[in-house]
């Protein structure tokens, strides 16, 4: 019997300092460019090697960005979201949602050392 794939969703506040080449990541999404089905949210599509986000290490490709400097990213056109990042200033606070894939074991399976039974 196959295991079930679940997702562990966590939120994190990430404070980035704009580096010499900017924040160092790309985004997809928006009300006019849905990248995830039935979700117009803004997602990280690429992290630039040695950019500010990469050097910080917490932001990951696939993360959903919920807000920038406290401004909600819901219901934004794609380009409006891009402009928000580009004009966000030197110190940028991101509220992000990480979605971690969790592989559960097969149903009915008990691992070694399971105290029950």
């Amino acid at each position: 019997m196959n295991g079930r794939v679940d997702y562990l969703v966590t939120e994190e506040e990430i404070n980035l300092t704009r580096g010499p080449s900017g924040l160092g990541f790309n985004i997809v999404g928006g009300t006019d460019q849905q990248y995830v089905s039935n979700d117009s949210g803004i997602y990280v599509s690429r992290i630039k090697e040695n950019g500010a986000a990469a050097l910080d290490g917490r932001l990951q490709e696939g993360d959903k960005i919920l807000s920038v400097n406290g401004q909600d990213l819901k219901n934004l056109l794609h380009q409006d979201a891009v402009d928000l990042f580009r004009n966000a200033g030197y110190a940028v606070s991101l509220r992000v949602q990480h979605r971690l894939q969790v592989q559960n074991g097969p149903i009915g399976h008990r691992g070694e050392g399971d105290p029950s039974g």
Epitope: F25, V44, H78
Partner: nanobody, 127 residues
């Protein structure tokens, strides 16, 4: 992934025009930011122009502003670079490039590190 093939290069006299094309194969073309770079002999590859996935936003390096125009046709999976008032210093190999999503940094910072997919290049010579 996306594959890119440039065309339209050639030999042109100073003051003349050329239109470069870049045909892309692959899915979700409108999710890709597209750019043009050029590389002169003995020099590094340099940013020329960029266009967002929907075509609503463009950026240019200072030396081509007012002379070059980047555009795209998402129905044809193609990006174009219209080059007018060409100068001898525009002589280079021109490369089409693509990256998924939109950079959150302005084109003032753009470099080849910002792009993941590249064409084979097309030679432009201005005499």
């Amino acid at each position: 992934d996306v594959q890119l093939v440039e065309s339209g290069g050639g030999l042109v006299q100073a003051g003349g025009s050329l239109r470069l094309s870049c045909a892309a194969s692959g899915r979700a073309f409108s999710s890709y930011t597209m750019g043009w770079f050029h590389q002169a002999p003995g020099k590094e590859r340099e940013f020329v122009a960029e266009i967002s996935g929907t075509g609503g936003n463009t950026g240019y390096t200072d030396s081509v502003k007012g002379r070059f125009t980047i555009s795209r046709d998402n129905a044809k999976n193609t990006v174009y670079l219209q080059m007018n008032s060409l100068k001898p210093e525009d002589t280079a190999v021109y490369y089409c490039a693509a990256v998924i999503g939109s950079p959150t940094d302005s084109t003032d910072y753009r470099s080849s590190l910002d792009y993941d997919y590249w064409g084979q290049g097309t030679q432009v010579t201005v005499s």
